[in-house]
Structures are given as structure tokens and as C-alpha cells.
Interface confidence: low
């Protein structure tokens, strides 16, 4: 149990789910959607899904891509439908403080996100909206 005041549910989005962790489901709900690519025993493993706990999603989405793994995150219903993660090419730098977004996919860095892809503040990350 936590000492802090209980929080209400975070706002969640419908996401495409693909991969072993999805079971029989083709969708899931999470505070962030993701698309990932990892190298496992020489094989390319593509996955799509949700981060349901905001802190978990933030940590993973903030992790810069490495030669063996890349994760792209977004916020918005079905926003990961057309995202395919790509491993970084040599000579291209990716600051660890930024979301890894590919320019050609019209996705931009966390600081510049707007519209449907807008990242919401901690205060707004609540599923029930108090006014």
C-alpha cells in the first residue's frame, strides 16, 4: 500500500496488440501504446501493445534505442496501428530524454507532440476527470 492520497484511474487508450503477450486478443487498453522491435537469437521480434502503468511506459519509452531493441510509444486510440519500430542506423544519435520517433512516419519528439499524439501532464493522467 502507498502512503500518498489514492489516485483515480488514468486515462487509457485503445491500442493494437500483436505478439505473445497479447494471448488471443488483438487489442488492449493502456496509457500509452507501443510498437517494438528486438533482436532475439538473431531473429527480429516485432510486438505491439500497451503500457498500462504510466511509470512503466514512461521508463520504457524514454529508453533510447540500441542495436538490439527499439520501442516507439504514442498516446491516442489505435495510434500504434501504423507504427513499425526500426533499429537505429550507425552514426545516428538518439538522446535518451526523447521518445524515439521516425521522421518519415510523421511522429515527432515528446517535447513537440501535439494534437492526437499530445503527451498529457501528470495531473491530467487520470481516468476520471475532476472539475
Amino acid at each position: 500500500m502507498e502512503d500518498e492520497k489514492p489516485k483515480v484511474n488514468p486515462k487509457l487508450y485503445m491500442c493494437v496488440c500483436e505478439g505473445l503477450s497479447c494471448g488471443n486478443e488483438d487489442h488492449c487498453e493502456g496509457q500509452q501504446c507501443f510498437s517494438s522491435l528486438s533482436i532475439n537469437d538473431g531473429f527480429h521480434v516485432y510486438q505491439k501493445g500497451c503500457f498500462q502503468v504510466y511509470e512503466q511506459g514512461k521508463m520504457t519509452c524514454k529508453t533510447p534505442p540500441s542495436p538490439g531493441q527499439a520501442v516507439e510509444c504514442c498516446q491516442g486510440d489505435w495510434c500504434n496501428r501504423n507504427i513499425t519500430a526500426q533499429l537505429p542506423t550507425k552514426g545516428k544519435s538518439f538522446p535518451g530524454t526523447q521518445n524515439f520517433h521516425l521522421e518519415e512516419q510523421k511522429l515527432i519528439s515528446e517535447e513537440d507532440l501535439g494534437g492526437e499524439q499530445k503527451l498529457i501532464s501528470e495531473e491530467d493522467l487520470h481516468h476520471h476527470h475532476h472539475h
Epitope: 486515462k11 487498453e29 481516468h127 476520471h128
Partner: antibody, heavy 115, light 107 residues
Framework: QVQLQQWGAGLLKPSETLSLTCAVY????????WSWIRQPPGKGLEWLGE???????NYNPSLTSRVTISVDTSKNQFSLKLPSVTAADTAIYYC?????????WGQGTLVTVSS | IQMTQSPSSLSASVGDRVTITCQAS??????LNWYQQKPGKAPKLLIY???NLVPGVPSRFSGTGSGTDFSFTISSLQPEDIATYYC?????????FGGGTTVAISR
Amino acid sequence: QVQLQQWGAGLLKPSETLSLTCAVYNGSFSSYYWSWIRQPPGKGLEWLGEINHRGRTNYNPSLTSRVTISVDTSKNQFSLKLPSVTAADTAIYYCSAHTRGFLYWGQGTLVTVSS
Amino acid sequence: IQMTQSPSSLSASVGDRVTITCQASQDINNYLNWYQQKPGKAPKLLIYDASNLVPGVPSRFSGTGSGTDFSFTISSLQPEDIATYYCQHYYDLPLTFGGGTTVAISR
């Protein structure tokens, strides 16, 4: 697909404590909020409260002083306790997994309070 | 927040267009869900965010609305649609449901 299986005593006497447990299968316990909802025979749905995997709870103010929801993440289970029951607590009780909507439901447990 | 659903019951023929309304006691943006409950079964989520169909739900079901007034439509009523339908908001706590609308087939 997430599956919820619930159990608990179905027949209680007035003043006894209602106790139900819901087990979660095929789903990440941290992926959802976990709620209890009840439905008196022939009537509508009433949300009782919710809990997440960290034990954060929110309750319906109409029952706050009575209802307790707890979680056991090691067993992927969550529970409902409602003390001092009366005939007005007779209902089908459902456990549910939800984010924006109640996406997955338990099979329901009819709890009858009768002397 | 009170959710007022109407009508409480209705009867229609197979193939008819059926509309149910739900009114919130205050502005809830589009934070509204619709459920179908068949006798002896748990409710099933059909529509979230007022108008978004849950994957796998037939396209004859639809929802519209924002603010305080919402509607749920079955474009062509089928025998398997016989059930009670509930709206539910998630704008604030406590989460509350409408009183339900029971849909029957008229002979």
C-alpha cells in the same frame, strides 16, 4: 483473453459479513483497475468500488463506510468485504476488469440476505 | 453524476431501427460507455468514448453524443439483440450507470 472467476458465500443472515473473491487469469494484474459491481434482482447496476495492483482504492460514497476491497497480487486475486448486511444487499455481485470501460466480467455471484 | 436513460423499455420488429437515449446530470464530455446485458449473463461492453465500437461488436450498433446528451442506435434490430442496454459514465467518481433499457421483439 482475460478471465475472471469469482466465489464466496451465497446465503447470509442479516448482520453477517459478505465476502467475495475474484481470481484473474490470462491477464497482467497491473494492466487494469479491478472493480466490484452489484445488481439487485431485476434492477440496474451499481458500482461499489475499485482497486489497482498497488492497492489504491476508490469507493462509491454511498457505501464508503462499509465496503472494503483488497488485493493479493501474489495470487492475482482481489476481494470484497461488506459487513453488517441487510436484505437491501441482496444482489448479483460481479467482479470486473476495467480501464475506460468494464471490459471483462466475472460470472456473477448471487448473494441472498435472509433471516 | 446521475445518468437518466429512456425509454425504460421498448418493443420493435426485426429489422427496425432502435434508438436509446442517455442524459447526464452534468457535462461529461464523451466519457460514456454502452453495455448489453442478456438475461442471466454479465454485461458486455459495446461502445466506449460515446461512439467507438469495441472490436468484434457488429457495426449495426453505434453511439453518438457529447456533453450531456447521448444516444445509442441499433440500425437493424436482430433477434439476438434482445437484451437490456445500459449507459455508464467515467467522467468522475463514483462511476454510475443509467437505469437500463430493455429491448424486446414485437410480434
